[in-house]
Interface confidence: medium
C-alpha cells in the first residue's frame, strides 16, 4: 500500500448540488439499433456517435444510421447526418479516427448492389465538415492510417488488391493484386503478403512476404513459404513451414526483412499457434501453443534480439487462434503482467509477474476476504481476475482489468478469493501498487473507470435493471458515494471517458424504454466542482514501487532499477488536471545474475542462477541460426536481459566460443531474396 | 453423518413468493457450494442456481434470474431458496444439493466436478388459486 | 446453455442383461459431467462424477466413460433395485443442466 494514508473516510460536501449542476443529458433522437463512438483527437472534447438501425427486409437488409457530433466532451451533441448525406453507414468498420490530433476521420458507407467501388466520407478538421469520395474498390477493411503520415492510407479490396492513397482517401492507386494481409510498418513501409495459387486459404504456408518502402513504387520479397506475418516493437516475425513436413517456426528480422533469423522456439503443427502477447522495442511475450487441443500453452520471453526465448510460463490458458486469453500488461506500472493458467485439474488460476516474466506468483489474498469454497485451506488461498475468458464463458463479468499509465499502481479487476477462478458472482478489487497487495472494492460486479489519473474512481453496477446511479471515489476506492443522476432509470449500455483518463467528465450510456418507443440517452458528468482546487506538491507522497524490505538496500530494484514516484495522497481532495505528468526518479542498481539471461547454447539447470552449455546443439529442437556478420555468434553464454539496466556488480565474464559450427537453418538465404519494380 | 435437511412442503397462491430452507450437518457447511434444483410433477430435474456459503455469492440460470434469490445464514449452517411471482408452472418438488463445484474450468480433461453428492430430501410447493 | 440429451427416452431390460445408457451435449463438456439415479419418491443420488469415477458406495456394476460431447453410463448387470430413471447433467459452463433422463424398466 502506498505510504502516508488517512484510513479514515473523507466524505465530499455537497456533492449533490455540485454533480447536478455539471449533468448533461441528451436524448438521441432515434431508435435503439446500436450505437458506436469516438473520441477524435486528444483534449479536444470532440466525439463522434454513430447510431445505425437495421431493418431487416426479405430480400436485403435496409438501414439508417445518425451521427452525431460533441465538443465539449458529450455535454452537448449536435446531428450532423447531412454532412454525411444520410447515407447508411457500415458499422463493421466503425469510424477510423486518424493517428494523434491529426483531426481526420474517415466513414465506410454502406452502397447498393451493382456499383463500381465503395464510398467514404472523409474529415481532416475533426469531423466539422465530410467530403464525399467514391471509390475505385469496394473495401474490406477498415482504412488504415500509416503512424508516420496521416495523409497515407492503405486498404484491402474484396478483390484481394492493396489499394494505397497518399493525398488522405482522395484518390487511390492499387499497387498489388492477391493480397491477404497487409500492415505498415515503421518509416511508411507497408508489409503485405501474397498468394500465387487462386487464395489465401489456399496458399497458407506457400504465401510470399512482400515489403514496400515507397508506397508502391518498388517491391522487395523478404520471405517465401509463409504461413503468417506480425509486427510487434521492432521486431517483424514471420511463421515459416519447414521443407520437411508440415510444422512451421517463427524468423525474426530487426532490419524490416532484409535478413532473418530463426527464433529459438519450438515449431508448431497444422492445429498449433503462436501468438505475439505483447511487445516493445525492447522484447517479446510469445506464446507458443501446446499440441493437442488442450486450451493452453508455454509463454516465452526474449532477448534483445527476439531471437534467444527464456520459458516464462507453462500451461497458459489460451483456448484457439484468435480465441480467448487472460493476457494483461498492467500500464500502470513497470514490469507487471497477469494472466491465467490452466492448472492439472483444470480449474484456471491466476498468475502475476513484476519483472516482465522472469517470475510468476500467484496473487497475494486480499487482506480481510475469506478464502471461498473452491479453496482446500481456508486459510491460505489468492486472488484469481476475471478477464477475457471469463467475460467470453458468460461469466457475470462485465470489465476486463483496467490500469493506466498515468494512474500510477492502480489496477482494478474483477476477482474471486481461493483456489481458482469461480462460477459465483465476482466482487470487484484494486490493487495500489500494481498487483502486489489487493483489496475489495466494490461487492458484486461493476462497470468502472479512471479519472484525472486517478484522483476519480467513477463505478456502475452490473444490472440487468435499469439504474440511475453512479458511484464514485476520491481515495482509490477506499470510500464510496452515490450519486442519484436520474430520476428515471436507463438500461445502462456502457461507459465512456476519454482515452488517457485525464479526463474530469464521464458518460453514462444508455436507453430509455416505454411501451411504443426506445431512445438512446447519455448524461454526461462533469466533476470538475467535487474536485475544487488544483493539487499542491502537498498533496503528493512518495512511493517506492516494487518495494518488498525497505531494509535492504536492492530493494525496489526491477530490470536493474528502482524507481520513487510522487504519488497523490488519498486523502488529498484535488486535481491532478489535464496537464499532470508522472514524476519519477530512476536509481540504477548493481547487477546480479538475474539480470541476465542465457544466450543461444546455454541453459539454466533448476535452482540455480549460472548459465551452463548445452552439450550438443546440432538437430536439437531449438536450433537457430543468425544471418549476418560471423562476430554475432561470439557468446560468453550470458546476454542482458531486454530493458535491464543495472551496472557494476555482478559481471558474467567466461570464454568467448564461436557458435556457428553449431548453427543449422535453411530459411531465406540471401539469394532466395529478389527485387522487383512497378 | 452428512445430511441436508430441507423445510416442510408449501401451498401457494399465483402471485406470492415461497422460502425454502435447507439445513446443512455433518461437514463444514462454507467447504461447499450448494445447488438448488427443481422437478415438476413427471418431469426431469431442472438446475435453479448455485450459493457459494464464504460471502454468500450466487449464480442462477437466467430462467429464475429476477425471480430467485439465494441466501445462507453460517451461523445455523442453513441456505434459503426464495422465488417470487409464483405461477401454476412452478409447483414442483425442490431440492437442495451439496455441489463441491463452483470453479470455472477449462480445457478438455476437467477432472474437477465430482457432482452434487448429498442431496435433501426435497420441498414440495403447489401452487394453485 | 448447453443443452443435453438422452437416448433412449425409456430402455426395457431383463434383470441380469447390460444396459447401456446415453447422454450427448450440444457442445464439449470435458469431463464435467455426472449420473444420477432416481428412484419414485425419492431425491436424486450421485452415481459418477468426472464422467467416469464411481462416487462412494456406488457398486462397481455402474461405470461411465466418455469425454466431450458423447457420454455412455453402463449398467453391466441388471438388479432389481437398478431399476429407476437415470439423468446426465454437466457443469462445465454455467448454467449446470441436466438430461431429459432415461427409464430402466423391467422387461
Known amino acids: 500500500s502506498a505510504p502516508g494514508e488517512d484510513e479514515e473516510c473523507g466524505r465530499v460536501r455537497d456533492f449533490v448540488a455540485k454533480l447536478a449542476n455539471n449533468t448533461h443529458q441528451h436524448v438521441f433522437d432515434d431508435l435503439r439499433g446500436s450505437v458506436s463512438l469516438s473520441w477524435v483527437g486528444d483534449s479536444t472534447g470532440v466525439i463522434l456517435v454513430l447510431t445505425t438501425f437495421h431493418v431487416p427486409l426479405v430480400i436485403m437488409t435496409f438501414g439508417q444510421s445518425k451521427l452525431y457530433r460533441s465538443e465539449d466532451y458529450g455535454k452537448n451533441f449536435k446531428d450532423i447526418t447531412d454532412l454525411i448525406n444520410n447515407t447508411f453507414i457500415r458499422t463493421e468498420f466503425g469510424m477510423a479516427i486518424g493517428p494523434e490530433n491529426s483531426g481526420k476521420v474517415v466513414l465506410t458507407a454502406e452502397v447498393s448492389g451493382g456499383s463500381r467501388g465503395g464510398r467514404i466520407f472523409r474529415s481532416s478538421d475533426f469531423a466539422k465538415n465530410f467530403v464525399q469520395t467514391d471509390l475505385p474498390f469496394h473495401p474490406l477493411t477498415q482504412m488504415m492510417y500509416s503512424p508516420q503520415n496521416s495523409d497515407y492510407l492503405l486498404a484491402l479490396s474484396t478483390e484481394n488488391g492493396l489499394w494505397v492513397s497518399k493525398n488522405f482517401g482522395g484518390k487511390w492507386e492499387e499497387i498489388h493484386k492477391a493480397v491477404c494481409l497487409a500492415k505498415w510498418g515503421s518509416d511508411n513501409t507497408i508489409f503485405f503478403t501474397t498468394y500465387a495459387n487462386g487464395s489465401c486459404k489456399a496458399d497458407l504456408g506457400a504465401l510470399e512476404l512482400w515489403r514496400t518502402s515507397d508506397l508502391g513504387k518498388s517491391f522487395k520479397t523478404i520471405g517465401v513459404k509463409i504461413y503468417s506475418f506480425g509486427l510487434g516493437g521492432r521486431f517483424l516475425f514471420a511463421s515459416v513451414m519447414a521443407d520437411k513436413d508440415t510444422t512451421r517456426r517463427i524468423h525474426v528480422s530487426t532490419d524490416q526483412g532484409d535478413t532473418w533469423s530463426m527464433a529459438q522456439l519450438p515449431s508448431v503443427g497444422q492445429e498449433q499457434f503462436y501468438s505475439i502477447l505483447a511487445a516493445n522495442d525492447d522484447m517479446v511475450f510469445m506464446h507458443v501453443d501446446e499440441p493437442g487441443d488442450t486450451g493452453f500453452g508455454t509463454i516465452f520471453t526474449s532477448d534483445d534480439r527476439g531471437i534467444v526465448y527464456s520459458k516464462s510460463l507453462d500451461r497458459h490458458l489460451y483456448t484457439t487462434t484468435g480465441g480467448e486469453t487472460d493476457f494483461t500488461n498492467v500500464t500502470s506500472l513497470r514490469g507487471v503482467y497477469i494472466t491465467s493458467v490452466l492448472s492439472e485439474d483444470n480449474s484456471i488460476q491466476t498468475m502475476i509477474t513484476f519483472d516482465q516474466g522472469g517470475r510468476w506468483t500467484h496473487l497475494r489474498k486480499p487482506e480481510n476476504s475469506e478464502c471461498d469454497a473452491t479453496a482446500k485451506n481456508k486459510n491460505e488461498c489468492s486472488l484469481h481476475i476475471h478477464a477475457s475468458y471469463s467475460i467470453s464463458q458468460k461469466l457475470n463479468v462485465p470489465m476486463a482489468p483496467l490500469s493506466e499509465p498515468n494512474a500510477v499502481g492502480i489496477v482494478i479487476a474483477h476477482g474471486s478469493v481461493g483456489d481458482a477462478i469461480s462460477v459465483m458472482v465476482p466482487d470487484v478489487y484494486i490493487s495500489d501498487d500494481g498487483g502486489a497487495s489487493w483489496t475489495k472494492m466494490l461487492e458484486g460486479p461493476h462497470y468502472y473507470t479512471i479519472l484525472d489519473s486517478g484522483g476519480i474512481i467513477v463505478a456502475i453496477e452490473h444490472s440487468s435493471r435499469p439504474i440511475n446511479v453512479i458511484k464514485f471515489s476520491t481515495d482509490e476506492g477506499q470510500c464510496w458515494q452515490t450519486y442519484t443522476f436520474t430520476r428515471d432509470p436507463i438500461y445502462f449500455t456502457g461507459l465512456a471517458s476519454e482515452p488517457g483518463a485525464r479526463s474530469m467528465n464521464i458518460s453514462i450510456w444508455g436507453f430509455t424504454e416505454s411501451f411504443l418507443t426506445s431512445q438512446w440517452v447519455s448524461y454526461t458528468i462533469d466533476f470538475k466542482d467535487i474536485l475544487e482546487r488544483n493539487c499542491e506538491e502537498k498533496d503528493y507522497t512518495i512511493w517506492l514501487a516494487h518495494s518488498t524490505d525497505p531494509e535492504d538496500y536492492e530493494d525496489g530494484c526491477i530490470l536493474g532499477y528502482k524507481e520513487q514516484f510522487l504519488r497523490l495522497r488519498k486523502s488529498s481532495v484535488c486535481q491532478n488536471g489535464r496537464d499532470y505528468v508522472v514524476t519519477k526518479q530512476p536509481s540504477i542498481c548493481l547487477c546480479s545474475l538475474e539480470d541476465f539471461l542465457c544466450d543461444f547454447g546455454y541453459y539454466r539447470p533448476e535452482n540455480d542462477s549460472k548459465c551452463v552449455e548445452q552439450p550438443e546443439l546440432k538437430g536439437h529442437d531449438l536450433e537457430f541460426c543468425l544471418y549476418g556478420r560471423e562476430e554475432h555468434l561470439t557468446t560468453n553464454g550470458y546476454r542482458k536481459i531486454p530493458g535491464d539496466k543495472c551496472q557494476g556488480g555482478v559481471n558474467p565474464v567466461r570464454e568467448v566460443k564461436d557458435l556457428k559450427k553449431k548453427c543449422t537453418s535453411n530459411f531465406l538465404s540471401p539469394e532466395k531474396q529478389n527485387s522487383k519494380s512497378n | 453423518q452428512v445430511q441436508l435437511v430441507q423445510s416442510g412442503a408449501e401451498v401457494k397462491k399465483p402471485g406470492a413468493s415461497v422460502k425454502v430452507s435447507c439445513k446443512a450437518s455433518?461437514?463444514?457447511?462454507?467447504?461447499?457450494?450448494m445447488s438448488w434444483v427443481r422437478q415438476a410433477p413427471g418431469q426431469g430435474l431442472e438446475w435453479m442456481g448455485i450459493?457459494?456459503?464464504?460471502?454468500?455469492?450466487?449464480s442462477y440460470a437466467q430462467k429464475f434470474q429476477g425471480r430467485v434469490t439465494m441466501t445462507r445464514d453460517t451461523s445455523t449452517s442453513t441456505v434459503y431458496m426464495e422465488l417470487s411471482s409464483l405461477r401454476s408452472e412452478d409447483t414442483a418438488v425442490y431440492y437442495c444439493?451439496?455441489?463441491?463445484?463452483?470453479?470455472?474450468?477449462?480445457?478438455?480433461?476437467?477432472?474437477?466436478?465430482?457432482?452434487?453428492?448429498?442431496w435433501g430430501q426435497g420441498t414440495t410447493v403447489t401452487v394453485s388459486s | 446453455e448447453i443443452v443435453m440429451t438422452q437416448s433412449p427416452a425409456t430402455l426395457s431390460v431383463s434383470p441380469g442383461e447390460r444396459a447401456t445408457l446415453s447422454c450427448r451435449a450440444s457442445?464439449?463438456?470435458?469431463?464435467?459431467l455426472a449420473w444420477y439415479q432416481q428412484k419414485p419418491g425419492q431425491a436424486p443420488r450421485l452415481l459418477i462424477y468426472?464422467?467416469?469415477t464411481r462416487a462412494t458406495g456406488i457398486p462397481a456394476r455402474f461405470s461411465g466413460s466418455g469425454s466431450g460431447t458423447e457420454f455412455t453410463l453402463t449398467i453391466s448387470s441388471l438388479q432389481s433395485e437398478d431399476f429407476a430413471v437415470y439423468y446426465c447433467?454437466?457443469?462445465?459452463?454455467?448454467?449446470?443442466?441436466f438430461g431429459g433422463g432415461t427409464k430402466v424398466e423391467i422387461k
Open positions: 444439493a451439496r455441489d463441491p463445484s463452483g470453479i470455472a474450468a477449462a480445457g478438455p480433461a476437467s477432472r474437477y466436478y465430482y457432482g452434487m453428492d448429498v
Open positions: 455433518g461437514y463444514t457447511f462454507t467447504s461447499r457450494y
Open positions: 450459493i457459494n456459503p464464504v460471502g454468500g455469492s450466487t
Open positions: 457442445q464439449s463438456v470435458s469431463s464435467n
Open positions: 468426472g464422467a467416469s
Open positions: 447433467q454437466q457443469a462445465r459452463l454455467g448454467p449446470w443442466t
